[in-house]
């Protein structure tokens, strides 16, 4: 699992590859802060609750974020 609480940032390794939006349990976007100088995106998968760190600079990940926000805006009244 590419996560660690012992370093300033949560993510050790990041992926450029998108996942299926429907397989996401949760998508956390952690802004840059005094503790970690970069934005971090942590995807929690429905299957096994596995967490994955996604590269916020990747165009494919940006496309994923757009798809997720579009899906959420459809659902909200």
């Amino acid at each position: 699992v590419p996560l660690s609480r012992t370093v300033r940032c949560t993510c050790i390794s990041i992926s450029n590859q998108p996942v299926n939006p429907r397989s996401l349990e949760k998508l956390e976007i952690i802004p840059a802060s005094q503790f970690c100088p970069r934005v971090e995106i942590i995807a929690t998968m429905k299957k096994k609750g596995e967490k994955r760190c996604l590269n916020p600079e990747s165009k494919a990940i940006k496309n994923l974020l757009k798809a997720v926000s579009k899906e959420r805006s459809k659902r909200s009244p």
Partner: antibody
Framework: QIQLVQSGPELKKPGETVKISCKAS????????MHWVKQAPGKGLKWMGW????????TYADDFKGRFAFSLETSASTAYLQINNLKNEDTATYFC????????????WGAGTTVTVSS | DIQMTQSPSSLSASLGGKVTITCKAD??????IAWYQHKPGRGPRLLLH???TLQPGIPSRFSGSGSGRDYSFSISNLEPADIATYYC?????????FGSGTKLEIK
């Protein structure tokens, strides 16, 4: 050099199953998603979906949900497309394409596998 | 899904001449368009991405421009090797879409 080598042509009957392969070489297989594209005879290119090569998770375009399955053999750097319960309209050339996910376009393609479905 | 309308479906031009192909998206695709050359029996070949960036090894006879919903692709100083079908691809969405293709013939 970077290449995607696809399996040879297939002749099948309606109702049968076909599984075609796409073997990657020249790069780290799990660093890039793999996509599949269909070209029916005399028609254009149609995107079918992709498989995340890190976790083996497939995502299908709406027109390819149900009878189509993407899978991997990571140790052999190979992606597979399986089509079940073949229909005449599945007659086409199928291409695998590596996606350069950081920028999100397809940069490397296989030469295609022709599947003919005929009774 | 984003729809891509490509035109013309075919065109014929003279050696040494210039051709232009257009693709129109049904929404803003933020310059995320790529162009491919496709010859029978081979996989498509990436020519340009992000509207106008040439892939390494692709001659500068190939060019692209556009923004918003409207994009164009040109080939100048046409050569026999340019005979092929050309496709645009939008990649500003998780769901990719190709244009319908333009078959180029040489007079």
């Amino acid at each position: 050099q970077i290449q995607l080598v696809q399996s040879g042509p297939e002749l099948k009957k309606p109702g049968e199953t076909v599984k075609i392969s796409c073997k990657a070489s020249g790069y780290t297989f799990t660093d890039y998603s793999m996509h599949w594209v269909k070209q029916a005879p005399g028609k254009g290119l149609k995107w079918m979906g992709w498989i995340n090569t890190e976790i083996g998770e497939p995502t299908y375009a709406d027109d390819f949900k149900g009878r189509f399955a993407f899978s991997l053999e990571t140790s052999a750097s190979t992606a597979y497309l399986q089509i079940n319960n073949l229909k005449n309209e599945d007659t086409a050339t199928y291409f695998c394409a590596r996606n350069y996910d950081y920028d999100a376009y397809f940069d490397v393609w296989g030469a295609g596998t022709t599947v003919t479905v005929s009774s | 899904d984003i729809q891509m309308t490509q035109s013309p479906s075919s065109l014929s031009a003279s050696l040494g001449g210039k051709v232009t192909i257009t693709c129109k998206a049904d929404q803003d695709i933020n310059k995320y368009i790529a162009w491919y050359q496709h010859k029978p029996g081979r996989g498509p070949r990436l020519l340009l991405h992000h509207t106008s960036t040439l892939q390494p090894g692709i001659p500068s006879r190939f060019s692209g421009s556009g923004s918003g919903r409207d994009y164009s692709f040109s080939i100048s100083n046409l050569e026999p090797a340019d005979i092929a079908t050309y496709y645009c691809l939008q990649y500003d969405s998780l769901l990719f879409t190709f244009g319908s293709g333009t078959k180029l013939e040489i007079k």
